[in-house]
Interface confidence: medium
């Protein structure tokens, strides 16, 4: 593959090829400046598979609070506003990176961790298993 | 609020209360071992608001590859398998943390960055604007 030349102004490290421990600047840069913040704010209520936003908190993790989706119904909302159990509301999950304090309670030492979070819900056709 | 006692075995840092630069171990711990990775793998096809997954790649970012959802239709799939334009397929977006190499091309120095990604799609009732 392409090898990008190493910037001569980089901080020193013992292993240039595969850093196990790296320095991370926590001043978060936000790439979302051009997004319209209103656009997905009420989907949780307007969806045919609506969800609630539930607090998942862990003081030893950054971010310490993650809002997780919990589908309100097993079925989906039909045109009449009723729950249709011929369809299923299911959570859309995503693996995200978080920082975990390691050793515990240390303010400046972390380990990268992957966690699975539910972001919202979608309405799917159920898988029907036919019994022979 | 509660102050968690600082672990005496922590690495040194200049500012104990608000670290700007921290050490991060990149050996990822995965908390998702008990989850079934196939569980939501086919929702993108079975959803009434189906989506395609597009590769978003950036070698200066960790993770360098992120799969982004793009809704297939403006409307939603109805019971007959047709697209119903009285409903809208919309992307469910989530802010996620990534590591951005800083300075560029440095293997062991990063900055925390928040980016907005589309994880999947959901079917919503449209907002109807009535003209007076």
């Amino acid at each position: 593959g392409i090898t990008i030349p190493r910037n001569p102004g980089c901080p020193n490290s013992e292993d240039k090829n595969f850093p196990r421990t790296v320095m991370v600047n926590l001043n978060i840069h936000n790439r979302n400046t051009n997004t319209n913040p209103k656009r997905s704010s009420d989907y949780y209520n307007r969806s045919t598979s609506p969800w609630n936003l539930h607090r998942n908190e862990d003081p030893e993790r950054y971010p310490s609070v993650i809002w997780e989706a919990k589908c309100r119904h097993l079925g989906c909302i039909n045109a009449d506003g009723n729950v249709d159990y011929h369809m299923n509301s299911v959570p859309i999950q995503q693996e995200i990176l978080v920082l975990r304090r390691e050793p515990p309670h240390c303010p400046n030492s972390f380990r990268l961790e992957k966690i699975l979070v539910s972001v919202g819900c979608t309405c799917v056709t159920p898988i029907v298993h036919h019994v022979a | 609020g509660i102050t968690i006692p600082r672990n005496p075995g922590c690495p040194n840092s200049e500012d104990k209360n608000f670290p700007r630069t921290v050490m991060v171990n990149l050996n990822i711990h995965n908390r998702n071992t008990n989850t079934n990775p196939k569980r939501s793998s086919d929702y993108y096809n079975r959803s009434t608001s189906p989506w395609n997954l597009h590769r978003n790649e950036d070698p200066e970012r960790y993770p360098s590859v992120i799969w982004e959802a793009k809704c297939r239709h403006l409307g939603c799939i109805n019971a007959d398998g047709n697209v119903d334009y009285h409903m809208n397929s919309v992307p469910i977006q989530q802010e996620i943390l990534v590591l951005r190499r800083e300075p560029p091309h440095c293997p062991n120095s990063f900055r925390l960055e928040k980016i907005l990604v589309s994880v999947g799609c959901t079917c919503v009732t449209p907002i109807v604007h009535h003209v007076a």
Epitope: N27, I28, N30, N32, T33, T35, P37, K38, S40, S41, N52, L53, H54, R55, E57, P59, E60, R61, Y62, P63, S64, V65, W67, R101, P107 | G1, I2, T3, I4, N17, F18, P19, Q93, E95, K114, L116
Partner: antibody, heavy 124, light 107 residues
């Protein structure tokens, strides 16, 4: 000193607009989700809106949805509430509040810092 | 939305009395509950967070307990400066919701 200072309130006619601001100081604003909460005269507290630390997630109370827009400028350490199509029932003291979720930095608890409030009166 | 039912809506007590206010959530909120004090013309002040943790600088006569759906706020020995309205607030689910308030007066 950790502080929130609201401004932009005043008297406005029904159907009119106002933009409230909340200037933060004494803490790293960009790390904290923020809220607007209001209190009608002689009434209880009512949550109005939420915005995530970088502005990518916003949530509104049903009573203001489609009329109010919460936003933030992290470079200016300022939170905003754009209020359109104002109604008499929007008359209230409007407070901004910080959700101190950054406990990993050993700070306090949710809604630990509030501004002093700015009064919005909607009347003809 | 989660409903928070606070009781009583008002109460009158004497200096030195033990005062108890209850708050009931319409569904399980774990311990994600705050208690606030609000004096006339002032912004709310956080007293208790996570149901039972005393915020820094708050006198120890204030305490909180409970989890799930039932919560209690207690002032062990009422002082004249405690005259205020007290609110519970859940922050387990968005939208965040408050109790309707309890107005505390001195007899």
């Amino acid at each position: 000193e950790v502080q929130l200072l609201e401004s932009g309130g005043g008297l406005v006619q029904p159907g009119g607009s106002l933009r409230l601001s909340c200037a933060a100081s004494g803490f790293t604003f960009s790390f904290y989700p923020m809220y607007w909460v209001r209190q009608a005269p002689g009434k209880g507290l009512e949550w109005v809106s939420y915005i995530s630390s970088s502005g990518g997630m916003t949530i509104y109370a049903d009573s203001v949805k489609g009329r109010f827009t919460i936003s933030r400028d992290n470079s200016k350490n300022t939170l905003y509430l754009q209020m359109n199509s104002l109604r008499a029932e929007d008359t209230a003291m409007y407070y901004c509040a910080r959700e101190s979720v950054a406990r990993w930095l050993q700070s306090g608890a949710a809604f630990d810092i509030w501004g002093q409030g700015t009064m919005v009166t909607v009347s003809s | 939305n989660i409903q928070m039912t606070q009781s009583p809506s008002s109460l009158s007590a004497s200096v030195g009395d033990r005062v108890t206010i209850t708050c009931q959530a319409s569904q399980d909120i774990g311990t994600f509950l705050n208690w606030f004090q609000q004096k006339p013309g002032r912004a709310p002040k956080l007293l208790i967070y996570d149901a039972s943790n005393l915020e820094t600088g708050v006198p120890s006569r204030f305490s909180g307990s409970g989890s799930g759906t039932d919560f209690t706020f207690t002032i062990s020995s009422l002082q004249p400066e405690d005259i205020a309205t007290y609110y519970c607030q859940q922050y387990d689910y968005l939208p965040i919701t408050f109790g309707q308030g309890t107005r505390l007066e001195i007899k």
